[in-house]
């Protein structure tokens, strides 16, 4: 069965948008006006995972690119990366665990917890123009709350 997907953009709780920074990295910065066109559009796919009543497993691909956010160990630390995949095989309902994030909605904000590394979240820095990363703390300096904007196909 084709996996159910929707197109969206994400902004962190400080209203920073996500843009490409080189071929395999995202960064977060404030955008206005025509610059908003730079923000990445995600194809969010609803996949199998350890679903609960308040966690929905999703995969986050870049629209019309064969790139997916994934979580891997680098130097013994959970790390967020953009990983290239074979477009003939992705997206799929049974994504490998490193591609799966638990989408958690709290007070109209979204968190994205790594399925591979529980309690590690897609995060941005307070500072402008810094890479999007996988952070192991919530409620500290780094930002783990996002809003989602739907984009028509």
């Amino acid at each position: 069965a084709p996996v159910r997907s929707l197109n969206c953009t994400l902004r962190d709780s400080q209203q920073k948008s996500l843009v490409m920074s080189g071929p395999y990295e995202l960064k977060a910065l404030h955008l206005q006006g025509q610059d908003m066109e730079q923000q990445v559009v995600f194809s969010m796919s609803f996949v199998q995972g350890e679903e609960s009543n308040d966690k929905i497993p999703v995969a986050l691909g870049l629209k019309e690119k064969n790139l997916y956010l994934s979580c891997v160990l680098k130097d013994d630390k959970p790390t967020l990366q953009l990983e290239s995949v074979d477009p003939k095989n992705y997206p799929k309902k049974k994504m490998e665990k490193r591609f799966v994030f638990n989408k958690i909605e709290i007070n109209n904000k979204l968190e994205f917890e790594s399925a591979q590394f529980p309690n590690w979240y897609i995060s941005t820095s307070q500072a402008e123009n810094m890479p999007v990363f996988l952070g192991g703390t919530k409620g500290g300096q780094d930002i783990t709350d996002f809003t989602m904007q739907f984009v028509s196909s």
Epitope: E50, N53, K55, K94
Partner: antibody, heavy 122, light 107 residues
Framework: EVQLQESGPGLVKPSETLSLTCTVS????????VSWIRQPPGKGLEWLGL???????YYNSPLKSRLTISKDTSKSQVSLKLSSVTAADTAVYYC????????????????WGQGTLVTVSS | DIQMTQSPSSLSASVGDRVTITCQAS??????LNWYQQKPGKAPKLLIS???TLPPGVPSRFSGSGSGTDFTFTISSLQPEDFATYYC?????????FGQGTKLEIK
């Protein structure tokens, strides 16, 4: 060898809370989810909900407001609590181990307990 | 929720017969379908996972096929110990849902 065993009172009064325990061996509750299923006398199987290795829970909608599933990993026990019971909750209650094979069979159930009959009656 | 329609609800057959039970899903579930056998007073036992895979120790007279929405469970040659109730389960999405069951009786 994987084993699951349900235990709890066989008789519960209407409006009270049904409490059952599933004691497991042969696998760790850190690594595998456990589901609860029930079967009213002479009827089919109804899936109630599950608890994952992480401790996160998923409850089937019709029972969501009355159902609580929790676990004590160190005791290898999973608990089910169903509040405000009526005669319609009379059933054999089973716990079952989730297959938990990512990318293959994440949601299937491979081993079941023998079940325990709970009667709701005053 | 995904609805599972199992048929027939009951079936009479003799030892040595070939028996087929079907299960239809209300939406495409790929191959995420399990079959269970339940004998009176006992817990269900997994016979087939992922539509066609036999777990270790399950006799080869049991088989499963299908994908998408239509699935079939077959016993190639009925044995006396096979008289029981059989259930399908979709394990594609939560909540998990069972078919209504097929009671296999001796003719």
């Amino acid at each position: 060898e994987v084993q699951l065993q349900e235990s709890g009172p066989g008789l519960v009064k209407p409006s009270e809370t049904l409490s059952l325990t599933c004691t497991v061996s042969g696998f760790s509750l850190r690594d595998y989810g456990v589901s609860w299923i029930r079967q009213p006398p002479g009827k089919g199987l109804e899936w109630l909900g599950l608890i994952w290795g992480s401790g996160d829970t998923y409850y089937n909608s019709p029972l969501k407001s009355r159902l609580t599933i929790s676990k004590d990993t160190s005791k290898s026990q999973v608990s089910l609590k169903l509040s405000s019971v009526t005669a319609a909750d009379t059933a054999v209650y089973y716990c079952a181990k989730q297959t938990n094979i990512w990318g293959y069979d994440l949601y299937g159930m491979d081993y079941w307990g023998q079940g325990t009959l709970v009667t709701v009656s005053s | 929720d995904i609805q599972m329609t199992q048929s027939p609800s009951s079936l009479s057959a003799s030892v040595g017969d070939r028996v087929t039970i079907t299960c239809q899903a209300s939406q495409d579930i790929d191959m995420d379908l399990n079959w269970y056998q339940q004998k009176p007073g006992k817990a269900p036992k997994l016979l087939i996972s992922q539509a066609n895979t036999l777990p270790p120790g399950v006799p080869s007279r049991f088989s499963g096929s299908g994908s998408g929405t239509d699935f079939t469970f077959t016993i190639s040659s009925l044995q006396p110990e096979d008289f029981a109730t059989y259930y399908c389960l979709q394990s594609d999405w939560l909540p998990l849902t069972f078919g209504q069951g097929t009671k296999l009786e001796i003719k």
